[in-house]
Every structure is written in C-alpha cells, then in structure tokens.
Amino acid sequence: PEPPTACREKQYLINSQCCSLCQPGQKLVSDCTEFTETECLPCGESEFLDTWNRETHCHQHKYCDPNLGLRVQQKGTSETDTICTCEEGWHCTSEACESCVLHRSCSPGFGVKQIATGVSDTICEPCPVGFFSNVSSAFEKCHPWTSCETKDLVVQQAGTNKTDVVCGPQDRLREQKLISEEDLGGEQKLISEEDLHHHHHH
C-alpha cells in the first residue's frame, strides 16, 4: 500500500508510517516500525503529560511555593498538573496562579459587592444614598442608614456614605399635645408645651 500522507487522531507520521501517540501519563521511548508498536513509558513521580503525545520527556508538576502564599488545591497525577491556590485571605495574581496577593479591603464609603475568592480579588462598590460603610473591610457590605422613625426618634444628624444617621428624641419644645376639652372650656386646640405652661400660670 502507498505510504500515508496523513494519520488518524492519536497517531503521528514518521518515516512514511503512522505511529500511535503515547497516551496521557506516558512519554515516547521509541517510534513504531513496520513490526513494532510505539514504545511508551509512564511518567515518573512528580511528572505528567496531559495529552496524547510524542514527547520524550514528561513535564514537572507545578510547585506551590508557600513563600509566595501558595498551597496545593489538587495534587497532580501522571496525567494532570498540580493545581495551586492561595492561602486564606489571599488570591492569585493570574490565571496560572503563580503567586498571591492579599485581598483588597473596601475603604469607608465603599462596601463589598463580591467577596474575594482564591482566584479573584474583592469587588467594592460605592455606598449609594441611604447606605454607609464606616470601616475598611474585605467582607462588610454597605449597611442601610438607621430608620429613626421606626424607633420613634427623629434624625438629629444626616447620614453620609461613611456615617450612619444620628437619631435623637423628639424636641420637647416643639412636641405637639392635644389639650382636652375641660382645660380649654370645651374648645379643642393644638398648642405647644410653652403655651400650655403659660395658660396654667394665668
């Protein structure tokens, strides 16, 4: 038969012959011949090859360097590389995760929109009107301003994106009271405490 010009998947062309590639986890020792198949050898400890290949050397597993904040997320096999991730509180600087940096904190006036993971940094967002953050944190979201009304209090100091509102009791001088009919000769009238005081002393 005519020598092939192309081979099937998982084969390679050499010396006008299609030879089988080595399977993942194995490296090439010798090419096939008319009478023998491709000879392959398993990768050694701490080595891998993750594809059908004709490599004569296996790749070394990645080293997760603790000095760079890295730790092993998944141990490598003869067919897969080691997967590194970052220690708690740190995240990878790249997709390859070759080193780690500390998670960013969101400054006062900003809250955490998305908590950092081993591979992504903290995402901050400015606190919108009605919300605040008074701390620098990698976990805290923007908190809503306190609702003074629900506590029967009034706003004494407006909130900002960095501070909560300050609530206080209602002003005694401006507090409205309803005078009963007996006190005002049957006439119902809204008067202030000041007026009431004046009325009683006359």
Epitope: R8, S20, C32, T36, E37
Partner: antibody, heavy 122, light 108 residues
C-alpha cells in the same frame, strides 16, 4: 481459520472478582492488538479495553478504569481480563475481539469470540 | 470522546426492500467508520470498514458510503437472514472506541 474462545464467566457477588480468558488461534497473535467488548442484556455494544500486540500497552474505558486489568500471554496465545470490585452494571456478555492493527489506536475488529456471560448479583 | 448516533433506532421492512441506516459522528472522522451486524445470541460480525470497503465474505447487497460526520449503510434487497441489529463504530480517534447505539431491523 481464526478462532477466539472466551471462558471464565459466571455468577459473582457485588465486590467480587472474576478472570476471563480468550484463547486465540488461526493467526499470529502477537501481531495484533486485542480488545474486550461487552453487551449488557438487551443493550448495545460497549468497548471495555484494548492491549497492543507486542509491548502490551493498555487502555481502558472510564467505566472500568482502576477495576479491570487487561493482559496477554503471547506464548500461550491467550488474552485475559481480570475484573475486580464488580458491580451490578458490569453484568453483560463479554466478547474478545481481534483488532486489525498492532497498536492501541487500531480497530476495526475483524473477528469476535462467541462471548461469555458475567452476572453480578447477590 | 467522539459520540456516534444511529437512526432510526428500529426499523420494520420486508424481504426485497431497500433499506438505509444512518450514522452521525459528533465530529469529523474522515472515512474511519465501520459497520457490524449482530444476530440474537451471536457475536457481532464486521460488514464494512473504512466507510465503504466490504469485508471479505460479505454479500454485495451491503454497501456503505459517507465521510466526515454522516454515513449510511444500505442493503439493496433485504434477505431473510439480514434481519438483525446493526452497529456503526468510529476508528478515527481511538481509544476509546465508540459504537452507535444500534439499529434493530425487524420483519414487517
């Protein structure tokens, strides 16, 4: 005339082991890759494993990887399948099949044995 | 892994009919497609290899065609002994070796 004759099938409990054999004749055994293919009752064909002709390189279907071991003895013209940690879903007729090539990227299968039934049940 | 899909899954026909079974690969497999016939209680038998080459001893009423992803097995004039289950198999990207789910050909 090419002949493939399987043996070793039978009833085995889940978690048990069984070793199948396939005696080959009528061709140069070491020149061809050999396969095991199985067929569950009333189902289609499922390829299980392959072993190359001279060196004895092996490859397995994901469903049996780590549990089954294919081997061959070229001096005895015999193919084997050692089956460990058997499960109910391994119940099937197991066929040995001769490849048309020497290496593990072979097929089609030009000759098949008559099959041996493996039943995994308690 | 390459998936092989056969259609129809079952088919009723009469002696003398022309029958076509199709097989589709999930990616191009060039012409590396084989067809097998299996009768109840028997081992499969190779009919056609390399999409269109007839295996030695197989009657000429069987033929195969196609390349890339779409293939057909044709029986030009059904004979009583042709009622069986037919399987396609790719041999382009192996191992793993993958078969179609089978087409059962029954007497009408």
């Amino acid at each position: 005339e090419v002949q493939l004759v399987e043996s070793g099938g039978g009833l085995v409990q889940p978690g048990g082991s069984l070793r199948l054999s396939c005696a080959a004749s009528g061709f140069t055994f070491s020149s061809y890759a050999m396969n095991w293919v199985r067929q569950a009752p009333g189902k289609g064909l499922e390829w299980v494993s392959i072993i190359s002709g001279t060196i004895g390189k092996t490859y397995y279907a994901d469903s049996v990887k780590g549990r089954f071991t294919i081997s061959r003895d070229n001096s005895k013209n015999t193919l084997y399948l050692q089956m460990n940690s058997l499960r109910g879903e391994d119940t099937a007729v197991y066929y040995c099949a001769k490849d048309t090539e020497r290496d593990i990227t072979g097929s089609p299968f030009d000759y098949w044995g008559q099959g041996t039934l493996v039943t995994v049940s308690s | 892994d390459i998936q092989m899909t056969q259609s129809p899954s079952s088919l009723s026909a009469s002696v003398g009919d022309r029958v076509t079974i199709t097989c589709r690969a999930s990616q191009s497999i060039s012409s590396y497609l084989n067809w097998y016939q299996q009768k109840p209680g028997k081992a499969p038998k190779l009919l056609i290899y390399a999409a269109s080459s007839l295996q030695s001893g197989v009657p000429s009423r069987f033929s195969g065609s196609g390349s890339g992803t779409d293939f057909t097995l044709t029986i030009s004039s059904l004979q009583p002994e042709d009622f069986a289950t037919y399987y396609c198999q790719q041999s382009y990207s192996t191992p793993p070796i993958t078969f179609g789910q089978g087409t059962r050909l029954e007497i009408k």
